[in-house]
């Protein structure tokens, strides 16, 4: 039973109120890296002039009407769009990355919805049709999160272009004060 989506709007109808937890992280898959290992040092790394801790995950507020075919909400709803880069300060403020936290070609951290809220809206329809009551799922907060196989590209496209893959060269990843002590913290953080 997936979410039933409005035809003309990215906002989704939801069956009930509540918070929707992030799916679990991908299991370790023993993939090896597929990269040239012994090339010379590149002349520079992208973003070397910029402090990696500068990037942030922003919450942009948008107000819009919810539509369902010819019907439109009586009042506009305010929701968040997640935007921005995910730098290490946003990922795990007290961490340093060691091999334990390394992932092949990732993990890919994106600025994506963290929590959702449900709002009841009344849809007004033309032609004297009776108003419809609906619950819609709206983004309530954003967070830098590790993408998993559960976050597919069609899901990502709704987060806006800035939420798409961080620019090439350096992708945030995880590490810890004492890695063992922080493992649970890391696993719960995303």
């Amino acid at each position: 039973q997936g979410w039933q989506a409005f035809k003309n709007d990215a906002t989704e109808i939801i069956p009930e109120l509540g918070e929707y937890p992030e799916p679990p992280p991908e299991l370790e898959n023993n993939k090896t890296m597929n990269r040239a290992e012994n090339g010379g040092r590149p002349p520079h790394h992208p973003f070397e002039t910029k402090d990696v801790s500068e990037y942030s995950c922003r919450e942009l507020h948008f107000t819009r009407y919810v539509t369902d075919g010819p019907c439109r909400s009586a009042k506009p709803v305010t929701e968040l769009v997640c935007s921005g880069q995910c730098g290490p300060a946003r990922l795990l403020p007290n961490a340093i990355g060691r091999g334990k936290w390394w992932r092949p070609s990732g993990p890919d951290f994106r600025c994506i919805p963290d929590r959702y809220r449900a709002q009841r809206v009344q849809l007004l329809c033309p032609g004297g049709e009776a108003p419809r009551a609906r619950k819609v799922r709206l983004v309530a907060s954003c967070k830098c999160k590790r993408l998993t196989r559960f976050h597919n590209q069609s899901e990502l496209k709704d987060f806006g272009t800035e939420a798409a893959r961080p620019q090439k060269g350096r992708k945030p990843r995880p590490r810890a004060r004492s890695a063992k002590a922080n493992q649970a913290e890391l696993e719960n953080a995303y």
Epitope: P88, A95, I96
Partner: antibody, heavy 126, light 111 residues
Framework: QVQLQQSGAELVRPGTSVKVSCKAS????????IEWIKQRPGQGLEWIGV????????NYNEKFKIKATLTADKSSSTAYMQLSSLTSDDSAVYFC???????????????????WGQGTSVTVSS | KIVLTQSPASLAVSLRQRATISCRAS??????????MHWYQQKPGQPPKLLIY???NLESGVPARFSGSGSRTDFTLTIDPVEADDAATYYC?????????FGAGTKLELK
């Protein structure tokens, strides 16, 4: 080219402090880690701690938590290690080394200490 | 804490022969099929020099006679053939987790 230049040898009295510097050049200082390593004469290598100059995050070896204080100055691309309440056990050569943080993906992924300072000899003697 | 046990403690090898140094970790240092074990060479009065990173990758500028192998807990550094310039102490090191640890070192001498 990448270089880590450490401060000169120190002869210090027991009970005092010393601050060793490690000036980085030839790469983006804030995008890599600086590790600190101790080597007593004729002995092996012992990890003291690490600092991420970009975020200021520090991890210490439990053994050196009280002894060492790591800092970094982004404006001068210099990392520092202060050793306090010095005793003869602290007489050693101290190295700084550049390391790679697994939070990031690099074009050429090493994730090891690929550049080292020349070492700073600290002798504690009355 | 991951303990690295290096063997032998010292090794005497003739020129142009093969030298093999072993490093055993008290627990796995692998993540997604990549081993966070590295090998360094140190000569008296000098800082350590990175030879092999992530178990088997030759660092830029290091002669191809150095090679590394192994995974999880068992790793090997091989020098073949040994040259006069290779007389030094060799250390394995893990950065799978903090605290970073080094092996006790293997002193390579030439016969």
């Amino acid at each position: 080219q990448v270089q880590l230049q450490q401060s000169g040898a120190e002869l210090v009295r027991p009970g005092t402090s010393v601050k060793v510097s490690c000036k980085a050049s030839g790469y983006a200082f804030t995008n890599y880690l600086i590790e600190w390593i101790k080597q007593r004469p004729g002995q092996g290598l012992e990890w003291i701690g690490v600092i991420n100059p970009g975020s200021g995050i520090i991890n210490y070896n439990e053994k050196f938590k009280i002894k060492a204080t790591l800092t970094a100055d982004k404006s001068s691309s210099t990392a520092y290690m202060q050793l306090s309440s010095l005793t003869s056990d602290d007489s050693a050569v101290y190295f700084c080394a550049r390391d790679w943080d697994t939070f990031y993906s690099y074009e050429r992924e090493v994730y090891a200490m690929d550049y080292w300072g020349q070492g700073t000899s600290v002798t504690v003697s009355s | 804490k991951i303990v690295l046990t290096q063997s032998p403690a010292s090794l005497a090898v003739s020129l142009r022969q093969r030298a093999t140094i072993s490093c055993r970790a008290s627990e796995s240092v692998d993540s997604y099929g990549n081993s966070f074990m590295h090998w360094y060479q140190q000569k008296p009065g000098q800082p350590p020099k990175l030879l092999i990173y992530r178990a088997s990758n030759l660092e830029s500028g290091v002669p191809a006679r150095f090679s590394g192998s192994g995974s999880r807990t068992d790793f090997t550094l091989t020098i073949d053939p040994v040259e006069a310039d290779d007389a030094a102490t060799y250390y394995c090191q893990q950065n799978y987790e903090d605290p970073l640890t080094f092996g006790a070192g293997t002193k390579l001498e030439l016969k």
